[in-house]
């Protein structure tokens, strides 16, 4: 049997049953999430659930730029350091850079300091690039 790989929205890339869209426009975290949702298909700011997934994403983004942090779908909505993925995925894999937790930083970004493989928390109203994800 021929198994067709599902198609992603124009400009998005496919990896392991998911479509990813790297948005090089600048939005705060909540606006970025709304832009992701506008694509339908259950799209949200991206959850990153394994080192393999993180590495694939990091390699893709590094082909475009290496200095701008990127919003992902991890946030701390209760402001109690109880982080959760906006798409409802289980918060098991963690890749914090170890610094910049706490303060008024309740949204997570992929940090450019370690080639986008680690995360930092940041103020949610900062305008940054962002990464969306959905399962086609």
């Amino acid at each position: 049997d021929i198994i067709m790989r599902p198609s992603c929205a124009p400009g998005w890339f496919y990896h392991k049953s998911n479509c990813y869209g790297y948005f090089r426009k600048l939005r705060n975290w909540s606006d970025a999430e709304l832009e992701c949702q506008s694509y339908g298909n259950g799209a949200h700011l991206a959850s990153i659930l394994s080192l393999k997934e993180a590495s694939t994403i990091a390699e893709y983004i590094s082909g475009y730029q290496r200095s701008q942090p990127i919003w992902i779908g991890l946030h701390d909505p209760q402001k109690r350091q109880q982080w959760q993925w906006i798409d409802g995925a289980m918060y098991l894999y963690r890749s914090w850079s170890g610094k910049s937790m706490g303060g008024n930083k309740h949204c997570a970004e992929m940090s450019s300091n370690n080639n986008f493989l680690t995360w930092s928390s940041n103020e949610c109203n900062k305008r940054q690039h962002f990464l969306c994800k959905y399962r086609p």
């Epitope: 400009g11 790297y22 090089r24 426009k25 939005r27 606006d31």
Partner: antibody, heavy 119, light 112 residues
Framework: EVQLLESGGDLVQPGGSLRLSCAAS????????MSWVRQAPGKGLEWVSA????????YYADSVKGRFTISRDNSKNTLYLQMNSLRAEDTAVYYC????????????WGRGTLVTVSS | QSVLTQPPSVSGAPGQRVTISCTGS?????????VHWYQHHPGTAPRLLIY???NRPSGVPDRFSGSKSGTSASLTITGLQAEDEADYYC????????????FGGGTKLTVL
Amino acid sequence: EVQLLESGGDLVQPGGSLRLSCAASGFTFSSYAMSWVRQAPGKGLEWVSAISGSGGSTYYADSVKGRFTISRDNSKNTLYLQMNSLRAEDTAVYYCAREDRMRTQLDSWGRGTLVTVSS
Amino acid sequence: QSVLTQPPSVSGAPGQRVTISCTGSSSNIGADYDVHWYQHHPGTAPRLLIYDNTNRPSGVPDRFSGSKSGTSASLTITGLQAEDEADYYCQSYDASLSGYVVFGGGTKLTVL
């Protein structure tokens, strides 16, 4: 084919108000952020304001903040710019432009509408 | 005064090659923000010419090319034609400003 058609430009006195409209067709309007960009006589392009596809987020240049309001009616495929407390320096051709969905470029533009602020 | 600096004017004879520069800083072009270029014939709608530093939208001739290095970007037009006479603008984003996008001051290209 993407089409953007601005209207509403006029001669208005300083301190007056005006509402510009931009009728969009040829694409799914609600999926795109939109901007207003202006060009004063003899000057370059100046970004004025932008609005997200849903209309939930708006952005303004410092020069118009508090005086101009951007809005959209996705059911009518129309973008608006409400201009209050107009000044002589607001005299310009005003263009509406569509922003690419994933990047910051303005990929489609209208031909513009002229706003003249003079007594 | 724009945060992106372009020469006010450039000129060239038909068939020649011209380059328009767009100089920024570490808070815009140098911060890995994309640069886009527009062509504007007065009285018409501006036209996207180059996006994401180097890419041409469909319908734009390959005589137009873009590049970016450090805190500067440039637009190069080869095989200059009479219809290329227009105003050209670079556009990026500046992290030090509260705005959304920022344009260069524009460059008037004259075909001699």
